[in-house]
Interface confidence: low
């Protein structure tokens, strides 16, 4: 007996071939001997089976002795043995229909679990193997689970169902809802405008929800809500914003915030959360702000940074085109009685400059100039 595997919702074509290459009488029946369809001369006739409106054949092939049974919009319960009667012969084809679905929405938040459920006909014992977009393989029986979805799990999952040495392939598009970056850090000189961007790692037709940026300034004892906003069909509208600092927010995606100027009291870490409509849980992105200030007070030239710096970052003060006068893994460095000239304050990581501020030291009878 020939075995054919089909996919729920798809169309299958079961073949039946006569030895004579001409149109002769044929019938397709199910295992209960109920007629599905056949012919009467050049006309297609249908029986009383439950497939009635979904069954068809290809009349163009009858003259070649081919009498296929086409079943559209396959259902699991269409799994059966189908019998083609032609030229006093009987050809049997066993059709097994499988379905594979994500048990929840196919749009899932980062960190959530994905469960794929296989629908199969009674008596079958299929095995399933799925390959994620990042190449990870998972195997299982009736259900497959992936916990802690990551951004790289977004895309097409390819699942192969194996039964009777035959296989059928399913493709399921999974969208992991997340920000492109889990964390970002912005380095700015005091007084500069700060741009925070929160690009999403997915695109959907309509995006609705609400969000908030909480900020923990390094100098503050507790965190503070800087801004709350609504998102409706990808349009952003601000609900509430603090007076200090007065953030501006872009009205389109990607989410974009502008801080008029970087000041030491703003240096710190923020957490932007986005709650999407009809989803449990929130998207998160951490953002950090490091602010640098170079000052000269009397005979002391000081360079300071505020905000979440790593212990391996180096802070240096150097006269332009000269060796560093002072270089420390600290958040403040200074030089007493600096000589006149253009001094550079540098924050660097393994030799790579992250932030630079220049200050001009004038001869002792003048006041310093900050370019």
């Amino acid at each position: 007996k020939k075995v054919v595997l089909g996919k729920k919702g798809d169309t299958v074509e079961l073949t039946c071939t006569a030895s004579q290459k001409k149109s002769i009488q044929f019938h397709w029946k199910n295992s209960n001997q109920i007629k599905i369809l056949g012919n009467q001369g050049s006309f297609l006739t249908k029986g009383p089976s439950k497939l009635n409106d979904r069954a068809d054949s290809r009349r163009s092939l009858w003259d070649q002795g081919n009498f296929p049974l086409i079943i559209k919009n396959l259902k699991i319960e269409d799994s059966d043995t189908y019998i083609c009667e032609v030229e006093d012969q009987k050809e049997e084809v066993q059709l097994l229909v499988f379905g594979l679905t994500a048990n929840s929405d196919t749009h899932l938040l980062q960190g959530q679990s994905l469960t794929l459920t296989l629908e199969s006909p009674p008596g079958s014992s299929p095995s399933v193997q799925c390959r994620s977009p990042r190449g990870k393989n998972i195997q299982g029986g009736k259900t497959l689970s992936v916990s802690q979805l990551e951004l790289q799990d977004s895309g097409t999952w390819t699942c192969t169902v194996l039964q009777n040495q035959k296989k059928v392939e399913f493709k399921i598009d999974i969208v992991v809802l997340a920000f492109q970056k889990a964390s970002s850090i912005v380095y700015k000189k005091e007084g500069e405008q700060v741009e925070f961007s929160f690009p999403l790692a997915f695109t959907v037709e309509k995006l609705t929800g609400s969000g908030e940026l909480w900020w923990q300034a390094e100098r503050a004892s507790s965190s503070k809500s800087w801004i709350t906003f609504d998102l409706k069909n990808k349009e952003v509208s601000v609900k509430r914003v603090t007076q200090d600092p007065k953030l501006q927010m872009g009205k389109k995606l990607p989410l974009h915030l502008t801080l008029p100027q970087a000041l030491p009291q703003y240096a710190g870490s923020g957490n932007l959360t986005l709650a999407l409509e009809a989803k449990t849980g929130k998207l998160h992105q951490e953002v950090n702000l490091v602010v640098m200030r170079a000052t000269q007070l009397q005979k002391n030239l000081t360079c300071e940074v505020w905000g979440p710096t790593s212990p391996k970052l180096m802070l240096s003060l150097k006269l332009e085109n000269k060796e560093a006068k002072v270089s420390k893994r600290e958040k403040a460095v200074w030089v007493l009685n600096p000589e006149a000239g253009m001094w550079q304050c540098l924050l660097s990581d393994s030799g790579q400059v992250l932030l630079e501020s220049n200050i001009k030291v004038l001869p002792t009878w003048s006041t310093p100039v900050q370019p």
């Epitope: 990808k234 509208s237 601000v238 501006q248 927010m249 872009g250 009205k251 389109k252 974009h256 502008t258």
Partner: antibody
Framework: EVQLVESGGGLVQPGGSLRLSCAAS????????MHWVRQATGKGLEWVST???????YYPGSVKGRFTISRENAKNSLYLQMNGLRAGDTAVYYC????????????WGQGTTVTVSS | EIVLTQSPGTLSLSPGERATLSCRAS???????LAWYQQKPGQAPRLLIY???SRATGIPDRFSGSGSGTDFTLTISRLEPEDFAVYYC?????????FGPGTKVDIK
């Protein structure tokens, strides 16, 4: 330098058609809402049409069904196709840019004059 | 349609004086969506205030905006000679994005 330059204005008979163009430069055109605003001599500003970044379009009742706004991002161009023109459509037509960060029209062209008269 | 009414129609003041312009909406407008523009004869309008109270880039701090709901105000703390012009409010929240009829500030 951010700039908007309108063209295509002129004299047209009632019932006639005209197509206005606006050439944008100095900014990422595709990222911004764009507008047409008109002003009859000695009168106030009247909003005519808006096209969003996704191609979504908005019109007041006075021009709906007669005017069509469109954009060609590859050419940094905004258009206004005006059909069934009436004497009341006579005005200076300004092309304008909606700001990316907030709701407000922050860049305006110098305008092109449309006169509908027999 | 949201109808914006501006008052007074004309405001006659001298340089150095304070100007208070009103914009009233026929229904509530989110303050995020309210803007003020200045227009001088023969010129295109210029954005002054967005979000009801935020000054646009390059606008002097003598211009300030306030208000919420249906009542909004543009204040010019000390009129300079270059401030004599027509001022329009606009709501950019609900289509049609209507303008007010304008208030003309002229020299007394």
């Amino acid at each position: 330098e951010v700039q908007l330059v309108e063209s295509g204005g002129g004299l047209v008979q009632p019932g006639g058609s005209l197509r206005l163009s606006c050439a944008a430069s100095g900014f990422t055109f595709s990222s911004y809402d764009m507008h047409w605003v008109r002003q009859a001599t000695g009168k106030g500003l009247e909003w005519v049409s808006t096209i969003g970044t996704a191609g979504d379009t908005y019109y007041p009742g006075s021009v709906k069904g007669r005017f069509t706004i469109s954009r060609e991002n590859a050419k940094n161009s905004l258009y206004l196709q005006m059909n069934g023109l009436r004497a009341g459509d006579t005005a200076v037509y300004y092309c304008a840019r909606g700001n990316y960060f907030y709701y407000g029209v922050d860049v305006w062209g110098q305008g092109t004059t449309v006169t509908v008269s027999s | 349609e949201i109808v914006l009414t501006q008052s007074p129609g004309t405001l006659s003041l001298s340089p150095g004086e304070r100007a208070t312009l009103s914009c009233r909406a026929s229904q509530s407008v989110s303050s995020s969506y309210l803007a003020w523009y200045q227009q001088k004869p023969g010129q295109a309008p210029r954005l002054l205030i967005y979000g009801a109270s935020s000054r646009a880039t390059g606008i002097p701090d003598r211009f300030s905006g306030s208000g919420s709901g249906t009542d909004f105000t543009l204040t010019i703390s000390r009129l300079e000679p270059e401030d004599f012009a027509v001022y329009y409010c606009q709501q950019y929240g609900i289509s049609p994005f209507t303008f007010g009829p304008g208030t003309k500030v002229d020299i007394k």
